[in-house]
């Protein structure tokens, strides 16, 4: 009986540890996409509607803040699109990029953890253009560090929750 009790406590401990594992999946807030054709920081994301969820991490001032030290898998998916109903592209040669950046408050510094993208020629003769970037990687993150997303040409962002999003989940503790 004692072994059974110990076993169930072990299960419960495992389960609660899993439930406490930090994760976040943030989706773009389509009502607040900045303008610009240069690199800009995307600061408006949903954390609690549709597919967006967050647990044991903090979203503040456009940045995803780590609350627990650990090794995390970070990912970002950014879609760019243009349809002729919204007007014409002022230039047909485009650099479509995403940058995933880590900022440390304790030792003020900023590092690009991942970047992805391409230069594109979006001809004015086509009715519709689309391009998707997906980046992902495994990083050691400390409590208080902040993750943010920068993109080029934000006026071309696809505002759907299944198109433009980023997130993180803790995989293991730092030994």
């Amino acid at each position: 009986e004692k072994a059974m009790v110990d076993g169930s406590w072990l299960d419960l401990a495992k389960r609660s540890k899993l439930e406490a594992q930090p994760f976040a999946h943030l989706t773009i807030n389509a009502t607040d996409i900045p303008s610009g054709s240069h690199k800009v920081s995307l600061s408006s994301w949903y954390h609690d509607r549709g597919w967006a969820k967050i647990s044991n991490m903090t979203f503040s001032n456009g940045k995803l803040i780590v609350n627990q030290d650990g090794f995390y898998y970070l990912y970002a998916n950014i879609c760019f699109r243009h349809h002729e109903t919204s007007g014409d592209l002022a230039t047909e040669y485009l650099q479509l990029m995403v940058y995933v950046t880590k900022t440390s408050i304790k030792i003020p510094s900023s590092h690009t953890l991942m970047k992805g993208g391409s230069t594109k020629y979006w001809s004015g003769n086509s009715e519709f253009h689309f391009y998707s970037i997906n980046v992902g990687g495994f990083f050691k993150l400390r409590s208080g560090e902040e993750i943010s997303i920068e993109v080029s040409n934000p006026s071309l962002l696809d505002p759907d929750q299944d198109a433009t999003y980023f997130g993180a989940f803790k995989v293991r503790d730092i030994d």
Partner: antibody, heavy 126, light 103 residues
């Protein structure tokens, strides 16, 4: 305040060319696109083309392709539209209009014409 | 190529009347629809952009509505200075115009 001032009325014979100017003031000329739109007597407004005043990129209506040239002089904050091989059906009032999208804020030419020139009457008659 | 169709082509109304002009697109254009006012010998004037946004400086008696393929311009209380021809527009395509006169 924002103003677009166009050159005066022109009379041309069929087969000739005409060049209409549009001088902008009251804003940073290079940050916007300029469109050219015309209206023939009794007809609807007709879009002809645009020029991105910043980089000189242009786009034209298929109807005018090969006959139209749009240029700009950023130092003079002026856009020009030249139409060649004129025919009687080109008799119209020609307007320049500013696109409302700032090129420094985005790269979509949105076709919201927030300021217009006063119009230039071009008469093509033999 | 998208075609814009306006109705009516002309209308006559009294001062103070509510006037409605309709614009139809040959396919869905979301909310990318603008309205302009043209008076003879004067520069055209943007009234409404993005289907319902009032351009700065335009009197509040003008309003726009609609999305997809059907749009309306409403003048809530017609004034003598509103005598003009009104055009809807989506990117490169304009409607044929609606001439508004006073009875």
């Amino acid at each position: 305040q924002v103003q677009l001032v166009q050159s005066g009325a022109e009379v041309r014979k069929p087969g000739a060319s005409v060049k209409v100017s549009c001088k902008a003031s009251g804003y940073d000329f290079s940050n916007y696109a300029i469109h050219w739109v015309r209206q023939a007597p009794g007809q609807r407004l007709e879009w002809m083309g645009w020029i991105n005043a910043g980089n000189g990129n242009t786009k034209f209506s298929q109807k005018f392709q090969g006959r139209i040239t749009v240029t700009r002089d950023t130092a003079a904050s002026t856009a020009y539209m030249e139409l060649r091989s004129l025919r009687s059906e080109d008799t119209a009032v020609y307007y320049c209009a500013r696109d409302s999208s700032q090129m420094v804020r985005g790269i979509i030419i949105a076709y919201y014409f927030d300021y217009w020139g006063q119009g230039t009457l071009v008469t093509v008659s033999s | 190529e998208i075609v814009m169709t306006q109705s009516p082509s002309s209308l006559s109304a009294s001062v103070g009347d509510r006037v409605t002009i309709t614009c139809r697109a040959s396919q869905s254009i979301s909310r990318y629809l603008n309205w302009y006012q043209l008076k003879p010998g004067k520069a055209p004037r943007l009234l409404i952009y993005g289907a319902s946004s009032l351009q700065s400086g335009v009197p509040s008696r003008f309003s726009g509505s609609g999305s997809g393929a059907e749009f309306t311009l409403t003048i809530s209380s017609l004034q003598p200075e509103d005598i003009a021809t009104y055009y809807c527009q989506h990117t490169r395509a304009f409607g044929q115009g609606t001439k508004v006169e006073i009875k």
